[in-house]
Each structure stands twice: as C-alpha cells, then as structure tokens.
C-alpha cells in the first residue's frame, strides 16, 4: 500500500466519557487515521487540536468551525443526557462510556462506516441506518438506552451524514494532504540485549528494531537460513516522533545462542535485511 | 463565492403544478443537505422541505407532504422542488438554502415568487 | 413541534443604541438555534448559528447567548444597515421551526 498505511484505512474519532458521580465527569476525544492520531479536542476551548501540518484536510475553516461548533453541543448535550438518564438506565457511578465511529476506505474507496458505544468496556448499543441498535448480549439496558438515542430522529440525521458524507470526503481529503508523510520510509535501527534470564542455563536474547515508518515489519531470530519458531515478538509501539518500535525476543540454553542472528525485513530496506549476528557486530546482508 | 438561483416560480392556478429549480455553485454540492424555505406575503419564514448531500434522505413539513417533491441532481449542481395540487396558501417567495451540517442555513438564494391564484 | 416565541414583536431604536431580542423555545432544544436578519425584498442571512457561533463574515457588534428554552441576540451598537427583521430558528428537532420575526425600525 502506497500510503504506507495497513489497509483497510480508516478515520475514527473516539470519546472517552468517564461519570465519577452526578456533578463530576470527564471526557477525551481524538481522531485518529487508523492507529496514527491526527486531532484531539481541546475541551477548556472547545475547539480540535491539529497534530499533524496536513490534519485539516481539504475542508476548509468555516468547515472546521461547523464541526466544532456540532461536537461542543454534543458533547454538552451527550453529557447532559447521560446524567439525566443514568439512575433509570441503571448507570452505576463510576462508569465510563466509549464511543468510536468513522468510516473505512478499502482500494481507494469508502466501504463503510461505523459507530460503536461501549458501557464499562463492553459492546452495548451500535448506530445503523440511521439509527441506533441494542447489541444483543447487552440486555435490557440497551433497548432502553436505544429507545431514548432514537427519540430525536434530527440528531440521527446529523449523525448518519457525518458517517455516510461528512467522514468519507474528509479521508480521501486526509490522505491527498497527508501524502508526503504517509507515504515516507524510515529505516529502522535494530540492536541485540540480554533479557532477564529465564532460568539456569538459559539465556532471553532480545532483538529490538526502532525507528521504523511504516509499521508492517518482520522480525525473526535466525540460525543460518532457518526461522526460529521459538521466536515471540511483542506489540509494535509507537513513538513520540511518529515511527514504531517492536521487540522480538528468544529463550536458548546458553550454549546454543552461538550461530543465532536477528533479521529485519521491512519496505524502507529495499530487500537489504539487517541481519544482527548474537556474536558479532551488525551487518547488513 | 456561494451561490444559489432560484427559477420556476409564476402564477399558476389552484390545483396546478409548478417546478422550481435552484442552480448551485462556490461549493461542494453533493456534500451538503438542501432545504426550501416559503415566506408568505408579509408574513414570516416557514420551512418546506430538505433533502440529505447523497439524495437519499427526503423530509417535509406536514403542510405540503404528499403534494411537494423535493430532489436534486448533484451532477448538475441543482436543487428542486415539484409542486403539485397547488393552493392558494402556498403563495409565497421560495427560497433555497444550503445547510450546513444539519445546524444552520447559512447561504440562501434570492428567492422567486410563486403565486397561487384563480 | 418545537413553538418559539420571539420578543419583542418589534422595537425602535436609535443609532449606537444596545439592542436586545429574547427567543423563548417551549421546550429545551441545547444550543441548536440560530439567528437571521432579512431586509426588505431580500433574503435572510445567518447571523448566528448554534446559540452562540458568529457565522463568517458577520459583524462582531452580534452576539448570541443562552440553551436550553431562552436566547437572546444582542447588538451592541445598532448601525443604519442594521434595521431590519429577525428571526430565530430551532434546529433540535424537526421540522425546523422560526420564530415569528422582530422588527427593528429607527426612533
């Protein structure tokens, strides 16, 4: 994928609502394009932050302003509905509230669109065809919540454009204005450690590879040509400048780690893997 | 620079028909939701009917629905409204109006008069 | 259906005088209200959007205020363009629903 994106991409934007009791809430919003984060909200202000030099897109400042203007009263009205609903949805303070929605794009083009709210971290009620619908396992509570989300078929409508219109033209627009970052190659670096030894006589090799734009990555240790299937490789991380980092680790009787090596394929190496020889320095191979 | 033109409108007896179009242009047109607007003589703003950026979503105050068709042609950058068994309280300036966002109409054309009468 | 009542029906007023126009929603609609002028034989235009959002392009002697049922616009120096009617919108819940129009003419 030229954007050096996974597909299918998306653009989600996530609200994080926690209720501490009736009075005291808080909430975090961002947007993200698919697992790189491109907006926060800014709820001292009430206005969206833009990390990134291309994260307004192609939409333009009275735009932008719209869709400020749309998430403050949400965000406003969404609190006040939730407080006033709580005690007959059986809302137990604390909770916490997820919402996620946005849209997909799959070969170029838009595929779908999503809007998900969790309570306590599970699945509770989903918006479609302009909508809401209980999620089966959630009960009675779900129905409920749905009865009241549906009362006010305006917001519905706002809703759905944002999915259907709002969301699909503002990623294809991300996308054109992000290009240059996107489609960037950062090649790793990658370095050999000891991990905390595992037991007598063994030994935890560690091969970590950072710094590396995009994020698809392979990482195995090796003896000679031949994967070693022991091999575990962690979470993908991201860091503070917008590349990854991933560690992938082994555990070996001390005197079989001798003939190991750690190689790194990844898109910005040009098929030229580093390879990381246990006993030597590094090479590239 | 928004723009928005409105055509179509005339005296037309009560029963008839009346087609009333509105060219758009100075912004995306297939993005956003379209609404007509009335305004009786002398009197205030009374919202018609609005149609979703896609076409796919249609809505109508109960006043006209069933009589009035709104629709939109988003290759043309046009806007319309198909009105049938006309009365005489349908008398009025007929607006056009883009929405922004589903909050607010935040540019509307110049209006053009349609007269309902015998 | 959302009624608004405006008030009032109409005032007079000077040049530089503060002008303040109430819009009352019989039920509570949050910040989702606007304000228009319209002159003679013209169009409305948007003033204000979401109680309290200038629209671009607008003078910044306008001002919006309240949610929930009462809003006012206020404009803190009235100048001769200004004379005009204004309406209210509601756009909470459908169908969308004016306020029946404030006239401001000179003293």
């Known amino acids: 994928n030229a954007d050096g994106l996974k597909e299918p991409l998306s653009f989600h934007v996530t609200w994080i609502a926690s209720f501490y009791n009736h009075s005291w809430k808080q909430n975090l919003v961002s947007g993200w394009l698919s697992d790189l984060q491109t907006h926060t909200w800014d709820s001292n202000s009430s206005t969206i932050v833009f990390l990134c030099p291309w994260s307004r897109g192609n939409f333009s400042n009275e735009e932008w302003k719209e869709l400020e203007t749309l998430f403050r009263i949400r965000t406003i009205r969404s609190f006040e509905g939730i407080r006033r609903y709580a005690h007959e949805l059986q809302f137990e303070y604390p909770f916490e509230i997820q919402v996620t929605g946005g849209c997909e794009l799959h070969s170029g083009k838009v595929s779908g669109s999503f809007l998900q709210l969790a309570y306590q971290g599970s699945d509770f009620v989903s918006f479609q065809n302009n909508s809401w619908l209980p999620y089966p396992v959630a009960g009675n509570m779900a129905k409920h919540f749905c009865k009241v989300l549906n009362q006010n078929q305006h917001e519905n409508d706002i809703t759905h454009n944002l999915l259907s219109d709002t969301c699909p033209r503002f990623i294809l627009g991300l996308l054109d204005a992000g290009k240059a970052h996107l489609q960037r190659q950062v090649k790793p670096e990658a370095w050999l450690s000891h991990g905390p030894s595992p037991g007598p006589g063994h030994l935890q090799l560690v091969c970590h590879v950072s710094g590396f734009y995009p994020k698809p990555v392979w990482v195995m240790w090796m003896r000679g040509e031949q994967e070693q299937q022991g091999t575990q490789r962690g979470d993908i991380l991201p860091s503070a400048d917008g590349t990854w980092y991933l560690r992938a680790t082994l555990e070996v009787a001390a005197g079989e780690a001798a003939d190991l090596s750690c190689r790194v394929k990844h898109s910005s190496l040009e098929g030229q893997d580093i390879v990381l020889y246990w006993e030597h320095h590094s090479s590239v191979g | 620079e928004v723009q928005l033109v409105e055509s179509g409108g005339g005296l037309v007896q009560p029963g008839g028909s009346l087609r009333l179009s509105c060219a758009a242009s100075g912004f995306t047109f297939s993005s956003y939701a379209m609404s007509w607007v009335r305004q009786a003589p002398g009197k205030g703003l009374e919202w018609v009917s609005a149609i979703s950026g896609s076409g796919g979503s249609t809505y109508y105050a109960d006043s006209v629905k069933g009589r009035f068709t709104i629709s939109r042609d988003n290759s043309k950058n046009t806007l319309y409204l198909q009105m049938n068994s006309l009365r005489a309280e349908d008398t009025a300036v007929y607006y056009c109006a883009k929405d922004a966002l589903w909050l607010a109409f935040d540019y509307w054309g110049q209006g053009t008069l349609v007269t309902v009468s015998s | 259906e959302i009624e608004l009542t405006q008030s009032p029906s109409s005032l007079s007023a000077s040049v530089g005088d503060r002008v303040t126009i109430t819009c009352r929603a019989s039920q509570s609609i949050s910040s989702y209200l606007n304000w228009y002028q319209q002159k003679p034989g013209k169009a409305p235009k948007l003033l204000i959007y979401?109680?309290?959002s200038l629209q671009s392009g607008v003078p910044s002697r306008f001002s919006g205020s309240g949610s929930g049922t009462d809003f006012t616009l206020t404009i803190s120096s009235l100048q001769p363009e200004d004379f005009a009617t204004y309406y209210c919108?509601?756009?909470?819940?459908?169908?969308?629903?004016f306020g029946q129009g404030t006239k401001v003419d000179i003293k």
């Open positions: 979401a109680a309290s």
């Open positions: 919108a509601q756009r909470s819940y459908p169908p969308p629903k």
